[in-house]
Interface confidence: low
């Protein structure tokens, strides 16, 4: 028998290299059954995940899955950083994996970081 | 078990004040948004306010806009409806419901269905 | 704001009997209409959301149907505990409206 448990199928480590100044869909790719869960964006902040409260959101629904979307219009700098999703679904809370956004502004012409830079400036994630 | 209670409603004159309180239980408060809505005797139902989880997003009916004011407070699990100015037309029993996203766009406070429902707090206004 | 209405406003029926109730719209809402069920005395209990999804626990012989204006409550088969009165609600746009009632009674 098929589970009824919620499940978010963001890969561990996924990332998207995207540019300033375009529209971007993140998406987070829900599973369920019969009720369709509160799902929220937070952006990773060290060690803790802030909520994404005024953001715009929707839904996408296809046969098997549906998405959670979280839009940029247009992509900011500052939205460079770590996402996760988290599902909460008959009082148990389900978070995704991260996925982190490599923001290029296009202004300054700047190379997506390596990711040993990212390693050693942790900072770059949550400017 | 998901529960609200409700307190705070009583007998006050036309002009009068009275703050309704909910308690939650059961559930992770901050999670959800929350609502206030009341029903005349023998009437239907009627959407009166709505919070978002950190009460960064408020909505009222226009019949109680300027003379009501929702509020919460998640570390007490707590929400509450001021109402001031009242009139003989807001006396009613007042439920408090949990919202709960089934629907398009941003997640805010007119977003949400309702469901869980509190079992009420009756107003009276008259002189 | 949206205007929610139901029909009838009440109904006399058996059990066993199958149940309709509508309600419609005064502009388009999508799916985004929810169905509650209120007892005499007792809160309201959601039933019905996006138009058809069952709420957990709520049985089977409830359905929901309809996009855009028009909309459907079904209860295939009337129980006893079903005579209630049922609510629709809106919920695309603000502020969230509900239609006024249709009352269940037993014939």
């Known amino acids: 028998k098929e589970s009824c448990d919620v499940q978010l199928y963001i890969k561990r480590q996924s990332e998207h290299s995207i540019l300033a100044g375009d529209p971007f869909e993140l998406e987070c790719p829900v599973k369920y059954c019969a009720n369709r869960p509160h799902v929220t964006w937070c952006k990773l902040n060290g060690t803790t995940c802030v909520k994404l409260e005024d953001r715009q959101t929707s839904w996408k629904e296809e046969k098997n899955i549906s998405f959670f979307i979280l839009h940029f219009e247009p992509v900011l700098p500052n939205d460079n950083g770590s996402y996760r999703c988290s599902a909460n679904f008959q009082s148990n809370l389900i978070e995704s994996h991260s996925t982190t956004l490599y923001v290029t502004d296009v202004k300054s012409a700047s190379e997506r970081p390596s990711k040993d830079e990212m390693a050693s400036r942790p900072w770059l994630l949550y400017s | 078990e998901v529960q609200l209670v409700e307190s705070g409603g009583g007998v006050i004159r036309p002009g009068g004040s009275l703050r309704l309180s909910c308690a939650a239980s059961g559930f992770t408060f901050d999670d959800y948004g929350m609502s206030w809505v009341r029903q005349a005797p023998g009437k239907g139902l009627e959407w009166v306010s709505g919070?978002?989880?950190?009460?960064?997003?408020?909505g009222y009916a226009a019949s109680v806009k300027g003379r009501f004011t929702i509020s919460r407070d998640n570390a007490k699990n707590s929400l509450y409806l001021q109402m001031n100015s009242l009139r003989a037309e807001d006396s009613a029993l007042y439920y408090c419901?949990?919202?709960?996203?089934?629907?398009?766009?941003?997640?805010?406070?007119?977003?949400?269905?309702?469901?869980?429902w509190g079992q009420g707090t009756t107003v009276t206004v008259s002189s | 704001d949206i205007q929610m209405t139901q029909s009838p406003s009440s109904l006399s029926a058996s059990v066993g009997d199958r149940v309709t109730i509508t309600c419609r719209a005064s502009?388009?809402?999508?799916?985004?209409l929810a169905w509650y069920q209120q007892k005499p005395e007792k809160a309201p209990k959601s039933l019905i959301y996006?138009?058809?999804s069952l709420q957990s626990g709520v049985p089977s012989r409830f359905s929901g149907s309809g996009s855009g204006t028009d909309f459907t409550l079904t209860i295939s088969s009337l129980q006893p505990e079903d005579f209630a009165t049922y609510y629709c609600q809106q919920y695309n746009s603000y502020p969230r409206t509900f239609g006024q009632g249709t009352k269940v009674e037993i014939k």
């Open positions: 996006a138009a058809s």
């Open positions: 419901a949990r919202d709960y996203y089934y629907g398009p766009g941003s997640p805010n406070y007119f977003y949400y269905a309702m469901d869980v």
């Open positions: 502009q388009g809402i999508s799916s985004w």
């Open positions: 919070i978002n989880w950190n009460g960064g997003s408020t």
